[in-house]
């Protein structure tokens, strides 16, 4: 039986050309966490932490993603194209997978401030 | 350099059991996984489970619950596949795969195969 | 399970021809499709991985696209060592992964 749940960053905004963490956390379970998978709004996937391999970076993001802080990503020089949702992918024994939900709006403001809260999707 | 060595080819009767192993090499074995994949004569390929080299967790292929089970033996590095009330449709050659990254990112290194013949 | 369905089953290309095999999935499995090449009597061999990403060691003339539920493998100029069989496998489903059923490649 799945009880946890996926807490994530929510709606955030950040600017142009600045970077964004994004950040997804697993409670209410006594899950092992065997892997978090990050991916894109257009189904690329950007990064992969596993617990005994540590993190893959897929190639075409390595110059813009960042692994880190802990689970999250950092995703660096945002651009307009980067407006969207990203899923982080929780792989969890025995419990199966838990997904979460961010949307990330890149503004073009230079007086956007970055905005992020945790809530419960 | 990773290697992955197979137990030679058997021939088993309709019934009976097989267990094939897989001994690793060249890298750290509690690292990642091995999956098992077969393939009968002149068809494709056909994924029958994982068994992680950390934990032991496994997954099996729906159709070959009950019949299969995965194990390994971090002492020495090998993974073990065994199948049992062997029926005739299960002649092919089986293969281990390394397999990382809950087997995500496919299966990077692989046995030679053993070649296993149910025939009565 | 997730169903993979190749095409074509196969095709005769000669050397230096760019050639393209396509796979699709029965429903969508994002960037979860890797790709190998198998010869006769050898164990197949990881090509691409996650749609695009070229495997360590495995020729810049092979490369992967698509997203979703439609996927390709292009060999962008055909080398004798690479006629052979060719199969696209889904890991989307980490309990119940699948392969197509696999693509010939042969000599013209």
């Known amino acids: 039986m799945m009880t946890g749940t996926i807490e994530t960053t929510g709606n955030i905004s950040a600017k142009k050309g600045g970077s964004v963490i994004l950040q997804c956390h697993l409670s209410s379970t006594m899950a092992q966490v065997t892997q978090v998978n990050w991916e894109q709004h257009d189904h690329s996937l950007l990064a992969i932490r596993n617990a005994e391999l540590g993190w893959h970076i897929y190639p075409a993001f390595k110059d813009r993603v960042a692994p880190g802080p802990g689970l999250g990503l950092t995703l660096q020089s945002l651009t307009m194209n980067d407006t969207g949702e990203y899923f982080c992918t929780y792989h969890t024994y025995p419990d199966g997978t838990y997904r979460g939900r961010i949307f990330l709006e890149v503004l073009e403001s230079s007086v956007a401030e970055h905005s992020a809260r945790f809530q419960i999707p | 350099q990773v290697q992955l060595v197979q137990s030679g080819a058997e021939v088993k009767k309709p019934g009976a059991s097989v267990k094939v192993s897989c001994k690793a090499s060249g890298y750290t074995f509690t690292s990642y996984g091995i999956s098992w994949v077969r393939q009968a004569p002149g068809q494709g390929l056909e994924w029958m489970g994982w068994?992680?080299?950390?934990?032991?967790?496994?997954n099996y292929a729906q159709k070959l619950q009950g019949r299969v089970t995965m194990t390994t033996d971090t002492s020495t590095s090998t993974a073990y596949m065994e199948l049992r009330s062997l029926r005739s449709d299960d002649t092919a050659v089986y293969y281990c795969?390394?397999?990382?990254?809950?087997?995500?990112?496919?299966?990077?290194?692989w046995g030679q195969g053993t070649l296993v013949t149910v025939s009565s | 399970a997730i169903q993979l369905t190749q095409s074509p089953s196969s095709l005769s290309a000669s050397v230096g021809d760019r050639v393209t095999i396509t796979c699709r999935a029965s429903q969508s499995i994002s960037s979860y499709l890797n790709w190998y090449q198998q010869k006769p009597g050898k164990a197949p061999k990881l090509l691409i991985y996650?749609?695009?990403s070229l495997q360590s060691g495995v020729p810049s003339r092979f490369s992967g696209s698509g997203s979703g539920t439609d996927f390709t493998l292009t060999i962008s100029s055909l080398q004798p060592e690479d006629f052979a069989t060719y199969y696209c496998q889904q890991s989307y489903s980490t309990l119940a992964i699948t392969f197509g059923q696999g693509t010939r490649l042969e000599i013209k």
């Open positions: 996650a749609a695009s």
């Open positions: 795969a390394r397999a990382g990254w809950e087997q995500q990112l496919g299966f990077d290194y």
């Open positions: 068994i992680s080299a950390y934990n032991g967790n496994t």
